[in-house]
Interface confidence: low
């Protein structure tokens, strides 16, 4: 089975690489615009130049194209703790990232928030903090790992998973949190 192609893909596939089919005349293949530019006017005929114009400030195209408009530059989300790694240019979108000793937590494919890397207090670093992953901690004796934090076994209750790790201390524990299920 041949996968279904959209109209644009069908039209482009008729022309050699780096060219696209003229929207009003399917016998003409026009040269695509370079990255950093956009399509202002289609080529008037075979072998004639496509009219491409440079993207204006605040917009870009990152690959060869026949877009009628450049794409708007992304803005780094300050409320997510993001910082600008490199500014937008005509041929590259803004690159956003996190500060030193922070990692990216992705809420969705395109939305991330910066959080401080865990310091593994009351434990040791098992895996260092990565660009997209928090530090992985291993806890010292008398502590157990909960939500990437080493918590004292005095906070362990019989109803929680920590009982295996905190077995010797579990008999005389007085919990400080409500562990009722909903």
């Amino acid at each position: 089975l041949v996968p279904h192609l959209g109209d644009r893909e069908k039209r482009d596939s008729v022309c050699p690489q780096g060219k696209y089919i003229h929207p009003q005349n399917n016998s003409i293949c026009c040269t695509k615009c370079h990255k950093g530019t956009y399509l202002y006017n289609d080529c008037p005929g075979p072998g004639q130049d496509t009219d491409c114009r440079e993207c204006e400030s605040g917009s870009f195209t990152a690959s060869e194209n026949h877009l009628r408009h450049c794409l708007s530059c992304s803005k780094c989300r300050k409320e997510m703790g993001q910082v600008e790694i490199s500014s937008c240019t005509v041929d590259r979108d803004t690159v956003c990232g996190c500060r030193k000793n922070q990692y990216r937590h992705y809420w969705s494919e395109n939305l991330f928030q910066c959080f401080n890397c865990s310091l593994c207090l009351n434990g040791t670093v098992h895996l260092s903090c990565q660009e997209k992953q928090n530090t992985v901690c291993t806890c010292h004796a008398g502590f157990f790992l909960r939500e990437n934090e080493c918590v004292s076994c005095s906070n362990c209750k019989k109803s929680l998973e920590c009982t295996k790790l905190c077995l010797p201390q579990i008999e005389n524990v007085k919990g400080t949190e409500d562990s009722g299920t909903t």
């Epitope: 809420w107 959080f115 865990s118 939500e147 990437n148 949190e177 009722g180 299920t181 909903t182």
Partner: nanobody, 119 residues
Framework: EVQLLESGGGLVQPGGSLRLSCAAS????????MGWVRQAPGKGLEWVSQ????????YYADSVKGRFTISRDNSKNTLYLQMNSLRAEDTAVYYC????????????WGQGTLVTVSS
């Protein structure tokens, strides 16, 4: 896009009750600890309560312990805050919050819901 929509606020007399709801979308609700924070008029944000992703651990600020109950329904992507024995000092805008760990900074969206306790 991550969205949190708080509702259920209103005017209530001291000693009364309210139930706040937070409808969540745009992220995998069941993966995250959720909570409530509030901002009284002219004051900073105050942490109120938090619940683990599975619902088996709940944490409360001392100021609300014994009066407020946090719960969640993972099948409905909804967080709740049952507020009983309300006091004038509970007057605030209440915001729904997402956490990636117990003491991680939270993030919140939406306008919040205003709770006014007054006679």
């Amino acid at each position: 896009e991550v969205q949190l929509l708080e509702s259920g606020g209103g005017l209530v007399q001291p000693g009364g009750s309210l139930r706040l709801s937070c409808a969540a979308s745009g992220f995998t609700f069941v993966k995250y600890s959720m909570g409530w924070v509030r901002q009284a008029p002219g004051k900073g944000l105050e942490w109120v309560s938090q619940i683990a992703n599975t619902g088996d651990r709940r944490y409360y600020a001392d100021s609300v312990k014994g009066r407020f109950t946090i719960s969640r329904d993972n099948s409905k992507n909804t967080l709740y805050l049952q507020m009983n024995s309300l006091r004038a000092e509970d007057t605030a805008v209440y915001y729904c919050a997402i956490y990636t760990g117990r003491w991680e900074p939270f993030v919140y969206w939406g306008q919040g819901t205003l709770v006014t306790v007054s006679s």
